[in-house]
Interface confidence: medium
């Protein structure tokens, strides 16, 4: 395209999520208490009032962040929300302060830690969910790092986080069965979902695997896993926790 | 959706319409029978109260979204680092009171996995009931359109969004305009197909106008948030 006047990026032009990176690459901004809203009877198709989630207006090279809502006369500074409810922005005081810490904006429903995070199995203490699987042990028993699974790449390769090596490793297919798959899915957050578990050829070039120690008895799956530099089946576990990403068009194609 | 076309039944089975007081306000994407991904700016106060919201799945026409077919929302979780001024970290989760029944018209989209490489001009799709022209009305029918990912470096150039795009955002559309998401599409999906599987790459967030030249759509970069999403699901279990 002729529009591409910029030089190519120095590092490959890819969008990639590098595992457990911090979600917000910028320092947390002070929390702003939103302005007060007055709810009027809903109209079906009123003008889009208010666009109280502002949009960014760009003018030449000086971007301006609009702070006013998009009124019916309308600045172009809007989020893509159809606030079709006639909620009118009224007088509001902007109280800026660290009192409303960002972490308080969401609540967790845990067993003993309903409002304050995830419970450590060993001590019953609660840790902030953002510290789970972050490479640093916060639970006395380190289980916030031991119970870490993820699916990697478009083939859903199951990887387990090793807090010893501080890195992710694919799980070897040797001795794997669907019960372990169910447990891994549960640990990822898929409560009652499990779709399929199969071995696929590992094309990632891994030289270190997590393998099941079948003689470990009836213990937690994570206690059965150990490091191995070899995987005799030459296959790693591909785990689907939910039958996702299929629409009528693609299911018709595959028939 | 500007420059799109009406969707066929089952083409975007993860798309939901999120209503407040019987009016479509935002879109969302089904990721499990209980969880919907949407935009954080959709649920800013006072709309952070789950009681306000009803989700409709599998229905392509707004007129047919009657009360009994909706799913009530039990919990709204906005990203803790969402910034309403800059729209950084514009993602939220809704947990439904009762799980969706999956069928041919109601299915989840896949969350992207780490290690998924997307090309700079990867073909994607956007969908929603948003306006079909700038300052237009909510659409009666679900629309969808093809868009291309736009490199962050290019989207951050002086002539586009001049460094307003953070790593938690992703641009998609066409620099010449004509095709874009618009008001009412917020929270809805930006998806791409890889290995014959549809992946949720973005949630509709913001843009300057709709379908304007050099003002493509900006979406929450779901890849950055998958860990956060799983943690919320895990904590809830």
């Amino acid at each position: 395209m002729a529009l591409n006047s910029g030089s190519p990026p120095a590092i490959g032009p890819y969008y990639e999520n590098h595992g457990y990176q911090p979600e917000n690459p910028y320092p947390a901004q002070p929390t702003v208490v939103p302005t007060v809203y007055e709810v009027h009877p809903a109209q079906y198709y009123p003008s889009p009032v208010p666009q109280y989630a502002p949009r960014v207006l760009t003018q030449a090279s000086n971007p301006v962040v609009c702070t006013q809502p998009k009124s019916p006369s309308g600045t172009v500074c809007t989020s893509k929300t159809k606030k079709a409810l006639c909620i009118t922005l009224t007088l509001g005081t902007f109280l800026v302060g660290a009192a409303l810490a960002a972490g308080l904006l969401w609540k967790f429903m845990g067993s003993k830690c309903s409002n304050s995070g995830i419970e450590c199995d060993s001590s019953g203490t609660c840790i902030n969910p953002s510290n789970w699987c972050d490479g640093v042990s916060h639970c006395p028993g380190g289980e916030d790092e031991n119970r870490c699974v993820r699916l990697y790449g478009p083939n859903f390769i199951l990887q387990v986080y090793s807090s010893q090596r501080k890195s992710w490793h694919p799980v070897c297919q040797d001795d794997w069965n669907e019960n372990y798959g169910r447990a891994a899915c549960r640990d990822m957050g898929y409560k009652n979902n499990f779709y399929s578990s199969q071995g696929i050829v590992d094309d990632s070039g891994s030289t270190s695997f997590m393998k099941l120690n079948t003689s470990a008895g009836n213990v937690d799956i994570y206690k059965k896993l150990y490091h191995s530099d070899a995987c005799s089946s030459k296959a790693v576990v591909s785990l689907r926790c939910i039958a996702c990403g299929v629409n009528l068009n693609s299911s018709r194609q595959s028939r | 959706i500007v420059g799109g076309e009406s969707a066929l039944p089952g083409a975007w089975p993860w798309q939901v319409s999120l209503h407040v007081q019987n009016v479509h306000v935002c879109g969302g994407s089904i990721i499990t029978p209980e969880w919907i991904v949407t935009a954080a700016h959709c649920v800013e106060k006072p709309l952070n109260n789950p009681a306000h919201w009803t989700a409709f799945a599998g229905i392509l026409r707004q007129s047919f979204m009657f009360y009994g077919a909706g799913y009530q929302v039990e919990k709204v979780i906005s990203h803790p680092n969402y910034d309403s001024k800059t729209k950084n970290n514009d993602i939220a989760l809704m947990k439904l009171q009762k799980p969706l029944t999956f069928n041919d018209l109601v299915k989840p989209v896949c969350l992207p996995n780490p290690g998924m490489m997307l090309q700079p001009e990867q073909l994607c799709w956007i969908s929603g009931w948003g306006a079909t022209e700038e300052k237009g009305k909510t659409s009666e029918v679900l629309n969808a359109a093809k868009v291309l990912l736009i490199e962050t470096q290019r989207c951050n150039s002086r002539y586009v969004y001049d460094n307003l795009i953070t790593p938690a955002m992703i641009c998609a559309g066409f620099l010449q305009g004509n095709v874009d998401s618009c008001q009412g599409d917020s929270g809805g999906p930006l998806v791409t197909s890889k290995n014959n599987i549809w992946w949720l790459i973005g949630d509709t967030s913001w843009g300057s106008g709709c379908a304007k030249a050099y003002r493509p759509g900006v979406y929450g970069n779901v890849m950055v948030f998958t860990d956060w999403i799983y943690r919320q699901m895990r904590a809830d279990g």
Epitope: - | S6, P9, T132, E140
Partner: antibody, heavy 121, light 111 residues
């Protein structure tokens, strides 16, 4: 070919209930809604409601709430309508009809054969 | 509820001539580029048969002598040239919102 086969005619007493069936064949049952339509002798058509077999979700015309109950059996690709507390006003031909659900264009492209219901003491 | 008024209630047309049936809605049934009006034909002892959907689209297998037009509140079904087998009752039906409703019907007879 695509067909909707309905149960045969029925003669029932006032106050009784009746379950009418509509068996679908020739297409994927879960992709479409089944609608029910009433036609009194020499009269026009009245839409009763629909059921979507994919999820079992229903919608009733306000006028028929409490009178008709729609159900499905996915295993046999059959839709049912239960009519309760029958009166002479319920004497009619009842049709099942298919419509696409998701796009909800709301037209009926395939119709059942019709079931004649006579309510008489 | 949207009320559909069909006119005339009945009409008699000679073979080969044009039959025009009108359907008026109590409020607009058009939105987002679609007109949610459909037409059916019903013969005695038979179920209705879809002829036209979304105001002007001919259902597959229906002869091209049937055509539909209109938008907003006023819609028309045209049959030209009328053939003997077209003697029937014709119904319009909207699906703009719920409940779905039908017109009272127009009976077409041949002269």
């Amino acid at each position: 070919q695509v067909q909707l086969q309905q149960s045969g005619p029925a003669l029932v007493k006032p106050g009784a209930s009746l379950k009418i069936s509509c068996e679908a064949s020739g297409y994927t049952f879960t992709y479409y809604s089944i609608n029910w339509v009433k036609q009194r002798p020499g009269q026009g058509l009245e839409w009763i409601g629909w059921i979507f077999p994919g999820s079992g979700s229903t919608y009733y015309n306000e006028k028929f709430k409490g009178k008709a109950t729609l159900t499905i059996d996915k295993s046999s690709s059959t839709a049912y309508m239960l009519l309760s507390s029958l009166t002479s006003e319920d004497s009619a031909v009842y049709f099942c009809a298919r419509s696409d659900y998701g796009s909800a264009y709301g037209y009926f492209d395939v119709w059942g054969t019709g079931t004649t219901v006579t309510v008489s003491s | 509820d949207i009320v559909l008024t069909q006119s005339p209630a009945s009409l008699a047309v000679s073979l080969g001539q044009r039959a025009t049936i009108s359907c008026r809605a109590s409020k607009s049934v058009s939105t987002s580029g679609y007109s949610y009006m459909h037409w059916y034909q019903q013969k005695p002892g038979q179920p209705p048969k879809l002829l036209i959907y979304l105001a002007s689209n001919l259902e597959s297998g229906v002869p091209a002598r049937f055509s539909g037009s209109g938008s907003g509140t006023d819609f028309t079904l045209n049959i030209h040239p009328v053939e003997e087998e077209d003697a029937a009752t014709y119904y319009c039906q909207h699906s703009r919102d719920l409940p779905l409703t039908f017109g009272a019907g127009t009976k077409l007879e041949l002269k």
